[in-house]
């Protein structure tokens, strides 16, 4: 009886690993073995494919042949017992276009309000990504372990800290990887469940900013108790995008080391051009906090992005505000050119109640104020480009009174 | 393979200073921390400090501090620990450990045993 | 300094038994805790990091837990090669300090 090809053959590539797959084409002869040839394109002869030969299964495993991930190959199969059936021959394919991205591996880090996520691919040194390595983002998808509610996070990279968690609660999450640059997108990794810490005794810092002044930044920050010093670390923002590197080499700003003040005054000559990630860390001699949430500070933008400057026209039951430019040391107005949005916060001098308007326009009209009344504003610019989302500090509170009633045109 | 090798076994007068070395090989010592921790006779581990080779940035445990210098020289995958105003209670191996990913002390020297005696 | 202690310091214990140790830590290190097996006259060698990740090559029977400041490193069957003197260190803050260790002895 002549033996029938080999059927329907499925080529899978996750990460180094290539995987066939076939369906036998007749179930009923017992003892036969396939095999497989490949030829690479511009070849005319066929060469055995190593690790599937002679395979009494329908699956086999060639990660051992050391391809040209983005050379054309040909595949075919034949079935073999006493004689040899016709080969079939799968369609051609690219490795690396057909190849997926495997899991990702994922280790976890608690703290008392935060998790570390450490991301590495799959696949160690891998052979098929190994052009793309620094191109991997990654998504995750976290959830309370009670409630199941999820969250998605997009386009992360190796490192990512995630703030504003529960103590004492089980977080599950898991990861995947893209490569944009091919339209790539991988497979999750399996869930890991991590609980977060009880809440430590110090919280950390908040609400760091940085300013420019003169030749110095200056770095403020927020905390609950008096007492405290305070050191400040930073890191450049690529290292957190390389692969498989989970050390992270943080360093001190000298004059941020042991600060007894919520701010710390350095020169810009500390930091070349560049993104950096900046954390501030408090402790009372005793106890530590944890580390802050890790603000971006791009000193490009950094050194442009000064708090606007602007003129208050008082009505009865409304401020007319114009905004300007801002002006450096020496009176000079700064030239922006890119695109701001402007952030206004005002309130009643004698109430904490803040309300806000956002806006992207230079004269705005603060509406709905009582007449004969002190009100103060402070004002902050923000940039609209996602990528470079950077805020100014906001301005010194100008505070005005609105004028009597009826005098609103 | 990751190795580090120590110089050999000393023998210090009270007061004298120690400088032990540790050679790295199958690594670049500049992508990772070098740590130093001693261990007494019978006794635990103690962390002395650390130094970045990259930078030769350090950080040393306030108990050393002031009595403790490291230094690194990258050319030949080298870092030093050396130890001043010695003591009897200075006597303890002392040992150079890589600092990997996740911060952690994945690989270690062999030891250098320290001996202050008069 | 953050204080790790240890508990016990001494454990005479049997092969095949299942081992428990614990490390305190006098204030909050999140999971950034590390054990180590150390054997007469050799160097420490890493078994457990950031709590409860076991470091390739070391056997299963080995697993830690714990956060903040209690941790625990267990041993489900121990073996020969086993007895020896266990570690454990915090890598939250520096100075990075180390738990008083427990010294396992054959019964």
């Known amino acids: 009886k002549n033996l029938k090809s080999p059927q329907k053959v499925e080529v899978d590539i996750i990460d180094d690993n290539f995987i066939l797959r076939w369906n036998r084409s007749d179930e009923s002869v017992g003892n036969v073995t396939f095999s497989f040839d490949y030829q690479k394109t511009g070849m005319d002869n066929w060469i055995k494919l190593s690790g599937c030969q002679n395979i009494t299964s329908t699956k086999c495993n060639f990660s051992s042949l050391k391809l040209n991930v983005y050379e054309e190959i040909k595949l075919r199969i034949r079935a073999e017992k006493e004689n040899t059936s016709s080969w079939y021959e799968v369609d051609s394919f690219t490795p690396f276009r057909k190849a997926q991205i495997g899991p990702p591996e994922v280790h976890l880090e608690a703290e008392d309000k935060a998790i570390v996520i450490h991301i590495s691919p799959g696949t160690k040194d891998s052979v098929m990504w190994a052009l793309d390595g620094l191109s991997f983002t990654y998504s995750l998808v976290i959830w309370k372990n009670s409630s199941g509610v999820e969250e998605r996070i997009e386009n992360i990279y190796s490192r990512h800290k995630i703030y504003k968690l529960s103590p004492e609660t089980t977080y599950c999450l898991k990861v995947k990887a893209a490569l944009l640059t091919s339209w790539k997108i991988g497979v999750y990794s399996p869930v890991h469940c991590i609980k977060t810490t009880v809440e430590n005794e110090l919280p950390p810092p908040e609400n760091i900013e940085v300013s420019v002044q003169n030749q110095n930044y200056v770095l403020k920050w927020d905390y609950t108790y008096a007492n405290m010093t305070f050191q400040v670390q930073w890191l450049h923002a690529f290292l957190k995008r390389n692969p498989g590197n989970h050390l992270y080499k943080w360093k001190q700003i000298p004059d941020c080391e042991n600060v007894k003040t919520t701010q710390c005054v350095f020169p810009q000559n500390v930091f070349q051009k560049g993104i950096y990630l900046l954390r501030v860390q408090a402790s009372d001699g005793n106890n530590t906090s944890f580390w802050s949430e890790e603000i971006k500070f791009d000193t490009e933008i950094q050194a442009f992005l000064l708090p606007p400057v602007f003129n208050i026209r008082s009505l009865s039951d409304s401020f007319h505000i114009y905004i300007g430019a801002p002006k450096q040391s020496g009176n000079t107005p700064v030239i922006q050119d890119y695109p701001l949005i402007y952030e206004i916060i005002f309130w009643e001098n004698t109430s904490n109640a803040e309300r806000k308007i956002i806006e992207k326009k230079t004269d705005v009209t603060v509406p709905n104020l009582k007449p004969l009344t002190v009100y103060c504003v402070k004002a902050r610019a923000h940039t609209m480009d996602e990528k470079l989302n950077k805020s100014s500090v906001f301005s010194d509170a100008v505070c005005e009174k609105t004028k009597p009633g009826n005098t609103s045109k | 393979q990751v190795q580090l090798v120590q110089s050999g076994a000393e023998v210090v007068k009270p007061g004298a200073s120690v400088k032990v070395s540790c050679k790295g090989s199958?690594?670049?010592?500049?992508?990772?921390?070098m740590h130093w921790v001693r261990q007494a006779p019978g006794q635990g581990l103690e962390w002395i400090g650390r130094?970045?080779?990259?930078?030769?940035?350090?950080k040393y445990a306030p108990k050393f501090q002031g009595r403790v210098t490291m230094t690194a020289d990258t050319s030949t995958s080298t870092v030093y620990m050396e130890l001043s105003s010695l003591r009897s209670e200075d006597t303890a191996v002392y040992y150079c450990?890589?600092?990997?990913?996740?911060?952690?002390?994945?690989?270690w020297g062999q030891g250098t045993l320290v001996t202050v005696s008069s | 300094d953050i204080q790790l202690t240890q508990s016990p310091s001494f454990l005479s214990t049997s092969v095949g038994d299942r081992v428990t140790i614990t490390c305190k830590a006098s204030q909050n290190v999140g999971t950034n805790v590390v054990w180590y097996q150390q054997k007469p006259g050799k160097s420490p060698k890493v078994l457990i990091y950031s709590a409860s990740y076991r470091v390739s090559g070391v056997p299963s029977r080995f697993s830690g837990s714990g956060s903040g400041t209690e941790f625990t490193l267990i041993i489900s069957s121990l073996q020969p090669e086993d007895f020896a003197t266990y570690y454990c260190?915090?890598?939250?803050?520096?100075?990075?300090?180390f738990g008083q260790g427990t010294k396992l002895e054959i019964k």
């Open positions: 450990a890589r600092g990997g990913n996740f911060y952690v002390m994945d690989y």
């Open positions: 260190q915090q890598k939250n803050n520096y100075p990075y300090t």
């Open positions: 130094i970045d080779p990259e930078d030769a940035e350090t």
């Open positions: 199958g690594f670049n010592i500049k992508d990772y921390y």
